[in-house]
């Protein structure tokens, strides 16, 4: 997992709430699941289910947990050391170049093409030309064959946010 979490909001600054455990920084940094105090003398635990940190750090705030959007399912909840993992619902997918939303998978291939790949949470169905075997560009076909796809079973999350 990377140190820079993509576009995560910061959790509200955490003053010493009673439920937040404190410990001393180790060599000036705080462990995963904690952030550093403003004077640099304490490590303060993140709040389970609200915020997190994944690395040894000198963050002044833990990072706010991602909330899965409608159209997504939660694969694993947010812990103090790992962000929520969200995945597109069955029949939808998220492409790397448009990660902001889940898009509906096509229900079939254009005429003259055959389906070689199912809809998965991270890819649309894959169509190839019957003769040449070259891939279809992915535009929604004007005319669809009666061949339809069944949503693929997810093998891994399509979007790791943390």
């Amino acid at each position: 997992e990377s140190a820079l979490i993509t576009q995560q909001d910061l959790a509200p600054q955490q003053r010493a709430a009673p439920q937040q455990k404190r410990s001393s920084p180790s060599e000036g940094l705080c462990p995963p699941g904690h952030h550093i105090s403003e004077d640099g003398r304490d490590c303060i635990s993140c709040k389970y289910g609200q915020d997190y940190s994944t690395h040894w750090n000198d963050l002044l705030f833990c990072l706010r947990c991602t909330r899965c959007d409608s159209g997504e399912v939660e694969l694993s909840p947010c812990t103090t050391t790992r962000n929520t993992v969200c995945q597109c619902e069955e029949g939808t997918f998220r492409e790397e170049d448009s990660p902001e939303m889940c898009r509906k998978c096509r229900t079939g291939c254009p005429r003259g093409m055959v389906k070689v790949g199912d809809c998965t949470p991270w890819s649309d169905i894959e169509c190839v030309h019957k003769e040449s075997g070259t891939k279809h560009s992915g535009e929604v076909p004007a005319v669809e064959e009666t061949v339809t796809s069944s949503p693929g079973t997810p093998a891994s999350p399509c979007s790791l946010s943390g």
Epitope: L4, L10, Q13, E27, G28, L29, L59, L60, F61
Partner: antibody
Framework: EVMLVESGGGLVQPGGSLRLSCAAS????????MSWVRQAPGKGLEWVAT????????YYPDSVKGRFTISRDNAKNTLYLQMNSLRAEDTAVYYC????????????WGQGTLVTVSS | DIVMTQSPSSLSASVGDRVTITCKAS??????VAWYQQKPGKAPKLLIY???TRHTGVPDRFTGSGSGTDFTLTISSLQPEDFATYFC????????FGQGTKVEIK
């Protein structure tokens, strides 16, 4: 007087490697968290790596993770940045920086060393 | 990442002028903002941290203010040695910087 002096910059081909050094003096080096920050030509500054005072813990941004390694030798008062699989976009002036005592931000910087990645 | 938008990118001023540089964070960073001064070929110098605390040896003509998302560096009366580039930095979540403001002689 706090002094940080970087060295090791130069011209390297894409895919190549380079190791930068930063010689520290004027303070107890082993007590401070240290970082590398870079500035590409005509662009803003970008944090590159951070290492704990004893050298046990490190962290990096996405852009360099898995390619760059920060390390330190407290006996020699020296900070290092090993840069592998260099890309054209890594071309920048690289600064070594010290995190202050109670401010959680950089209080002293070196004057930088230029790394140019080009074929 | 938290984006720090600094303005203006450059300005021309005369000795004795009052100069104001602003920095806007893309989300709340509390008061975890520092301001630095840099001259060509030199190391950046810390001026202000925690948004308004002057670093050791920094003249009192340099003043920082703001909290949340809006921050300002003010030089009350510009001196010849103040012509330089200034940049802001947030340090609440990792470290990100403004693009810099070049203060030039009018």
């Amino acid at each position: 007087e706090v002094m940080l002096v970087e060295s090791g910059g130069g011209l390297v081909q894409p895919g190549g490697s380079l190791r930068l050094s930063c010689a520290a003096s004027g303070f107890t080096f082993s007590s401070y968290v240290m970082s590398w920050v870079r500035q590409a030509p005509g662009k803003g500054l970008e944090w590159v790596a951070t290492i704990s005072s004893g050298g046990s813990y490190t962290y990096y941004p996405d852009s360099v993770k898995g390619r760059f390694t920060i390390s330190r030798d407290n006996a020699k008062n020296t900070l290092y940045l090993q840069m592998n699989s260099l890309r054209a976009e890594d071309t920048a002036v690289y600064y070594c920086a010290r995190r202050g005592d109670s401010m959680i931000t950089t209080d002293y910087w070196g004057q930088g060393t230029l790394v140019t990645v080009s074929s | 990442d938290i984006v720090m938008t600094q303005s203006p990118s450059s300005l021309s001023a005369s000795v004795g002028d009052r100069v104001t540089i602003t920095c806007k964070a893309s989300q709340d960073v509390g008061t975890a903002v520092a301001w630095y001064q840099q001259k060509p070929g030199k190391a950046p110098k810390l001026l202000i941290y925690w948004a308004s605390t002057r670093h050791t040896g920094v003249p009192d003509r340099f003043t920082g203010s703001g909290s949340g998302t809006d921050f300002t560096l003010t030089i009350s009366s510009l001196q010849p040695e103040d012509f330089a580039t200034y940049f802001c930095q947030q340090y609440s979540s990792y470290r990100t910087f403004g693009q810099g403001t070049k203060v030039e002689i009018k």
